[in-house]
């Protein structure tokens, strides 16, 4: 096959990204200031540790989790970092403008950084469905649209349904999954002949993807408990998430073996299934009254994740053009829905027990929230997909999908590969 030179993003990316960064700096200059009131330095350190856990999850966890492609591992890790850095900046401003702007200034606290990191994490979950098929300029667009959509979704849910930070952020799993899938659906799908090998996984990148999964596994309790209001709720969330992810690891590895005719364990299944419990338990992690329930939920989530990884990739590859190893999208969509259903079940049990006759109303509110999250995810995802298809972004040629050499300088390789 004749060599197809990559479409250069030299004119497009630096101008676009640096102009945007300059605009962000100006916005920070005019509209933000630090919270100068912290009296208790020990409290500051404790609060920072949660934010640090979230940053590790985002930069190392999701960065490496998506790096399993044979020839796209560099781009996966670095693009994730780029999106995280940009996403956090925009999320801090957006959250500030939406929640505290009447006072004229956005006050930046450790909590607002925590919130912004979680918002940016949404993009890193979604992008798994499109990594390898887009360049950095397109990813900048995706970051801006998704963070804006999620920020507005959270504000609308908070105002209409009166939910707290934790509840409106826990829609992130479903939102990110459906956003990513709808963007992927809009992008050119078929892989041209001769490039099929590029979306296959390789041993060393797969090992780094496993490292990413381990980091996510370790810090998932921090993610699920980060926005809860009281120490007892945080404690419950940490414990329940820990039990759920512990069981989902055992289920993932044994279930993967069970799903293979020769009883072999699939790396791809394990990468995502180890996190299944954390996603499924997310919405209700502070409500689950005992460990065994969290463990059962982890078990069910692990089985759903392995089952999904076995049967859904074929469908996703045909319909959405998502490679077999990028299973985070449909995984999170199924598990996120499971988590929301568990939350509604707990709500019903509570309301029945209270005997105040408001079951229908409470369930209706929860279904309304979930529906709104899915609708906004699909609509904003489709909008993003259409935007990414514009010629101005100089998207990589289909023959150059999943190829680090399009974006990175490798001195030891021949020029003009």
């Amino acid at each position: 096959m004749s060599s197809k030179y990559p479409r250069s993003v030299r004119r497009c990316l630096p101008l676009w990204a640096l102009t945007l960064e300059a605009a962000l700096i100006l916005l920070f200059y005019f509209f933000t200031h630090y919270d100068a009131s912290l009296e208790d330095q020990k409290g500051l350190v404790a609060s920072y540790q949660v934010g640090q856990d979230l940053t590790v999850m985002a930069a190392i966890g999701l960065g490496f989790l998506t790096s399993s492609f044979r020839r796209h591992s560099w781009s996966s890790v670095a693009f994730n970092l780029f999106m995280l850095a940009l996403g956090v900046q925009w999320a801090i401003l957006l959250d500030g403008f939406l929640s505290q702007f009447p006072s004229g200034k956005v006050v930046i606290t450790l909590f607002s950084i925590r919130l912004a990191t979680m918002s940016a994490l949404s993009v890193l979950i979604s992008v798994d469905a499109v990594l390898g098929k887009v360049n950095l300029a397109q990813l900048v667009v995706m970051v801006l649209v998704e963070v804006t959509a999620l920020g507005n979704l959270r504000m609308v849910i908070s105002n209409i349904f009166n939910t707290d930070y934790h509840m409106n952020m826990m829609h992130i799993y479903v939102f990110a999954a459906y956003f990513g899938l709808s963007v992927a659906w809009c992008l050119p799908k078929p892989l041209p002949e001769g490039t099929e090998d590029k979306d296959q996984t390789a041993t060393i990148p797969s090992l780094s993807a496993m490292l990413g999964a381990l980091f996510l596994w370790m810090f998932w309790p921090s993610f699920n408990s980060a926005l809860l209001r009281s120490p007892i709720e945080r404690k419950n969330a940490v414990f329940n998430t820990y039990y759920a992810v512990a069981v989902s690891v055992v289920t993932a590895i044994s279930g993967s073996s069970l799903a293979h005719p020769q009883g072999k364990i699939s790396k791809t299944y394990v990468h995502s299934a180890v996190l299944a419990g954390g996603v499924a338990v997310g919405t209700s992690c502070h409500l689950i009254p005992s460990p065994w329930l969290a463990m059962v939920l982890g078990l069910v989530a692990g089985l759903i994740s392995v089952g999904g990884a076995k049967y859904l990739p074929g469908c996703c590859n045909r319909v959405l053009g998502i490679p077999h190893s990028s299973i985070m999208g449909y995984n999170f969509s199924l598990l996120g829905l499971l988590g929301e259903i568990i939350y509604i079940v707990l709500l019903v049990l509570d309301t029945v027990g209270a005997g105040n006759g408001m079951i229908g109303f409470q369930v209706l509110l929860s279904i309304g929230e979930l529906s709104l999250a899915i609708v906004i995810a699909l609509m904003s995802g489709l909008l993003t997909g259409l935007l990414l298809n514009l010629k101005i972004w100089k998207a990589p040629h289909e023959a150059k999908y999943f190829d680090d050499q399009v974006f990175w300088k490798f001195p030891h390789l021949a020029v003009g590969f």
């Epitope: 105002n159 009166n162 707290d164 209001r229 120490p231 709720e233 502070h286 009254p289 049990l349 509570d350």
Partner: antibody, heavy 128, light 110 residues
């Protein structure tokens, strides 16, 4: 017993600053969110600000946003309210209150929140 | 910011029953707002009566009860007594951030 004692009130000119303190005793201060609530003479109660148990998050009423700052020092069991650019309409008795959380779910571990313990209040008068 | 509405004043005969309500300027009050009720007599700090919609605080007589009536939170006093003559405030928790007090109801026991 659980006790909250406010201090720092007084007479101050418009545009000036004042810092209120609330000393807590009889409970684990670092485990509870704290509120400031005020009551202008002859008027109803008005919520002013809240700070989470670990100081990580704060919220303010629109009427004080950008002028008042709530903070806490868990090592000293003390809550603060820094009031800048004071106006005549800020004249009130200022109460601090503990945010208590109680299990509201009969089956789940759901919690709900309310203000259960109040201080006796400190009076702030803004007048020229 | 959301406005929480209460009846400015209410009268009840001794031994009678009175229901004070707490609504939102826009929307319905549900358990998600953690409605709570406070009693205040002149010159005193508020005292918690009801929290989490319908849970009585310790030491509060059982003639006080809380509920959701239609789209409002409600405080019902059955068998009103002379010392129930006070100001009653409801407070709603607004999801991610602020709390809002109602304007208060001045209850007179005639």
């Amino acid at each position: 017993q659980v006790q909250l004692v406010e201090s720092g009130g007084g007479v101050v000119q418009p545009g000036r600053s004042l810092r209120l303190s609330c000393a807590a005793s009889g409970f684990t201060f670092s485990s509870y969110g704290m509120h400031w609530v005020r009551q202008a003479p002859g008027k109803g109660l008005e919520w002013v600000a809240v700070i989470w148990y670990d100081g990580s998050n704060k919220y303010y009423a629109d009427s004080v946003k950008g002028r008042f700052t709530i903070s806490r020092d868990n090592s000293k069991n003390t809550l603060y309210l820094q009031m800048n650019s004071l106006r005549a309409e800020d004249t009130a008795v200022y109460y601090c209150a503990r945010e208590f959380y109680t299990r509201s779910g009969l089956w789940s571990q759901g919690y709900s929140y309310y203000m259960d313990v109040w201080g006796k209040g400190t009076t702030v008068t803004v007048s020229s | 910011q959301t406005v929480v509405t209460q009846e400015p004043s209410f009268s009840v005969s001794p031994g009678g029953t009175v229901t004070l309500t707490c609504g939102l300027s826009s929307g319905s009050v549900s358990a998600r707002y953690y409605p709570s009720w406070y009693q205040q007599t002149p010159g005193q700090p508020p005292r918690t009566l009801i929290h989490s919609t319908n849970t009585r605080s310790s030491g509060v007589p059982d003639r006080f009860s809380g509920s959701i009536l239609g789209n409002k939170a409600a405080l019902t006093i059955t068998g009103a007594q002379a010392d129930d003559e006070s100001d009653y405030y409801c407070v709603l928790y607004m999801g991610s951030g602020p709390w809002v007090f109602g304007g208060g109801t001045k209850l007179t026991v005639l």
